[in-house]
């Protein structure tokens, strides 16, 4: 899952300070104990750039190698740069490691535009900023790539969050997490807190900028506002969700349900934009025209191409519409929808035009794949992967960019009958419906 | 086939304002199609953007001008304007006005342009 | 601040000959860029937009190429219409408000 228009992004004005915080209602489920509280080492242990991914840091190796790691909640390999590369100013040396085994197989990852490939092994890895555990896990040493790592991103490797089921070579390769959680009592659960910058950052601000937080085994209450509402995970191989329906300011698309999620729709950290199937994504792009029709702009915006631009502090969100998804609830006929806002799907951009100016791309965009949850709905929620009870949950997140008037929001529950047809049923044929590329 | 003239004073006394009006003849100015532009060039150098309206009413200015312009509509007139405070006589140039076309990309269409000179 | 650089800053060609004009953006701007045409005394006139396509009435002896940082305007076989200044501009941060400094092409 990645490149492009697949990795984290930033949008639109700071967000609250924490004496504006909305009190945060009772959670009405029970928790299982430990799932809950505070992780306060955890907290703030991402970084990012705009578009260009969040990233955690890692240690590998004995004695330890520390490398910053790309969070991907949309692939399951955990793959290190392991060779000198021209954007790398870092990379795991395996020989330098006396926790090193070989597993004598190679692995080879194919992207729409890009690819790397490596050799297996497994190590010895452990989360500065996480919890206080090493674990032995299985890791792919990157020794040639193309269109991979990102000049100027400070990440030198890639954390595939996923199921097993997408791993390549092969279902046999264990993820990270699944090796974590069986060597540790560290619960099956991870929560992330995506952070827009909200404002175009320069060179020296992004370095210096906070991202969020990869919460590992629970959820943090300071991270978000209001309830958790959860989606059933539809199935373990990426995070796939069912989206029921889908609103621009409150007017319905009023497409067959199915479409939405043709061929899956997936939550992924690793895409930078709010990515939908193409009648989707056309019927999307007609209405937010038709609600912000007192400005006109390029077709080249739309695409996702050509920058935008207002003299600084102008920039006219109240144009733009909010985008509602529905996604099934955990009760039956019961959904629920999040909302974002325009600070969330337009992607502030830096070093375009002058200082006195703030330029944003569009980030929504069209997909062959399905939909995909990118950080630009990421970015307006605390996201819970709660993989031991199979669901995902968003709450409004605390970091959440946003102005006066509006506010990202996650609301429910709404009743909708027949949600189970809106998912797609994927013909099985051989290996060849398993896309990695995703650009 | 539709037609842009610029008109108003060709000269200005420094630290006034700079007046100017387009007239759209042969088309209409509430065509959703375009946005109308204008854009100066001083004697002898090269060309500088100051800023389109749609007919909405809807604006973008050049920072570099620093809020001394405002550009508005008359779609009753199928005319726009320029307003420039506070000039001096590096705003001297020749001013033209401009449909913003092609998708609302690009200047395909020009006025003559005027000469507005600023001195006392 | 995308920056557009023009090169040469004059070119001198007799009639029939080619000219090759070259504008060079400091980042790149994708396919988004325009090359107008300007004469003395009078307003410019839109050549090619979006890199490579003319604009209508635009004679087929000019033609523009390039993408991202690198465009060219070629003028297969200049006739004495064609001495004028010539400028590019780039609309990929919109709205377009980045002109280059020009090339004059003159007589020889």
């Known amino acids: 899952t990645h490149l492009g228009i697949r990795l984290p992004l930033r949008s639109g004005l700071a967000g609250p300070p924490l004496g504006l915080r909305l009190p945060r209602e009772t959670d009405e489920e029970s928790e299982e104990p430990g799932r809950r509280g505070s992780f306060v080492e955890m907290v703030d242990n991402l970084r990012g750039k705009s578009g260009q991914g969040y990233y955690v840091e890692m240690t590998v190796g004995s004695p330890p190698q520390t490398l910053n790691i790309l969070v991907d909640t949309g692939s399951s390999n955990f793959a290190v740069g392991a060779a000198p590369h021209p954007f790398l100013h870092r990379y795991y040396q395996r020989q330098l490691s006396s926790t090193y085994r070989d597993l004598r197989k190679g692995v080879y990852v194919p992207y729409t535009q890009g690819k790397w490939e490596g050799e297996l092994g497994t190590d010895l890895v452990s989360i500065p900023h996480g919890p206080n555990v090493t674990v032995r896990a299985n890791i792919a040493a990157i020794t040639e790539s193309d269109k991979f790592f990102i000049n100027g991103s400070n990440w030198e490797g890639i954390l595939g969050l996923a199921y097993a089921e997408i791993a390549r070579p092969d279902d046999s390769l264990e993820p990270f997490f699944d090796s974590l959680v069986k060597q540790t009592h560290i619960p099956n659960i991870f929560s992330l807190q995506l952070c827009g910058a909200g404002f175009p950052l320069n060179q020296t601000e992004a370095l210096a900028s906070v991202g969020g937080s990869m919460i590992i085994g629970g959820i943090d209450h300071s991270l978000y506002t209001g309830r958790l509402w959860y989606t059933p995970i539809r199935r373990e191989w990426y995070y796939e969700v069912i989206i029921v329906r889908v609103e621009i300011n409150g007017q319905d698309l009023k497409m067959d349900c199915k479409e939405y999620n043709y061929d899956k729709s997936i939550v992924d950290s690793g895409t930078t934009n709010l990515r939908l199937p193409k009648k989707v994504f056309e019927a999307a792009v007609k209405s937010i025209k038709a609600a912000s029709s007192t400005e006109k702009f390029p077709d080249g915006f739309w695409l996702g191409e050509q920058l935008v631009c207002w003299q600084a502090g102008t920039t006219p969100w109240n144009i733009f519409p909010v985008i509602s998804l529905y996604l099934m609830g955990e009760v039956t006929n019961q959904s629920f929808r999040i909302t974002i806002l325009p600070q969330q799907y337009l992607r502030p951009v830096e070093d375009v035009a002058t200082s006195q100016d703030d330029c944003y791309k569009f980030a929504v965009s069209q997909s062959s794949t399905g939909t995909v949850m990118g950080a630009v709905i990421m970015e307006g929620f605390y996201v819970v992967f709660d993989r031991a009870r199979k669901r995902i949950g968003f709450a409004v997140s605390a970091c959440h960019v946003h102005d006066e008037f509006r506010t990202a929001a996650v609301e429910g529950p709404f009743v909708t009958a027949d949600m189970e047809d809106c998912g797609y049923n994927i013909p099985q044929t051989d290996e060849s419906t398993l896309m990695t590329g995703r650009a | 086939q539709l037609q842009l003239q610029e008109s108003g004073p060709g000269l200005v006394k420094p630290s006034e304002t700079l007046s100017l009006t387009c007239t759209v003849s042969g088309g209409s100015i509430s065509s959703s199609s375009y946005y109308w532009g204008w854009i100066r060039q001083p004697p002898g150098k090269g060309l500088e953007w100051i800023g389109n309206?749609?007919?909405?009413?809807?604006?973008y200015y050049n920072p570099s001008l620093k809020g001394r312009v405002t550009i508005s509509v008359d779609t009753s007139k199928n005319q726009f304007s320029l307003k420039l405070s506070s000039v001096t006589a590096a705003d001297t140039a020749v001013y033209y006005c401009?449909?913003?076309?092609?998708?609302?990309?690009?200047?395909?269409?020009w006025g003559r342009g005027t000469l507005v000179t600023v001195s006392s | 601040e995308i920056v557009l650089t023009q090169s040469p800053a004059t070119l001198s060609l007799s009639p029939g000959e080619r000219a090759t004009l070259s504008c060079r953006a400091s980042?790149?701007?994708?396919?988004?860029l325009a090359w107008f045409q300007q004469k003395p005394g009078q307003a410019p006139r839109l050549l090619i937009y979006?890199?490579?396509n003319r604009a209508t009435g635009i004679p087929a002896r000019f033609s523009g190429s390039g993408s991202g940082t690198d465009f060219t305007l070629t003028i297969s076989s200049l006739e004495p219409e064609d001495f004028a200044v010539y400028y590019c501009?780039?609309?990929?941060?919109?709205?377009?408000?980045?002109f280059g400094g020009g090339t004059k092409v003159e007589i020889k």
């Open positions: 309206i749609y007919y909405s009413g809807s604006t």
């Open positions: 979006d890199a490579s």
């Open positions: 980042q790149s701007v994708s396919s988004y």
């Open positions: 501009q780039q609309v990929y941060v919109w709205p377009p408000r980045t």
């Open positions: 401009a449909r913003l076309g092609h998708g609302y990309n690009y200047f395909d269409l």
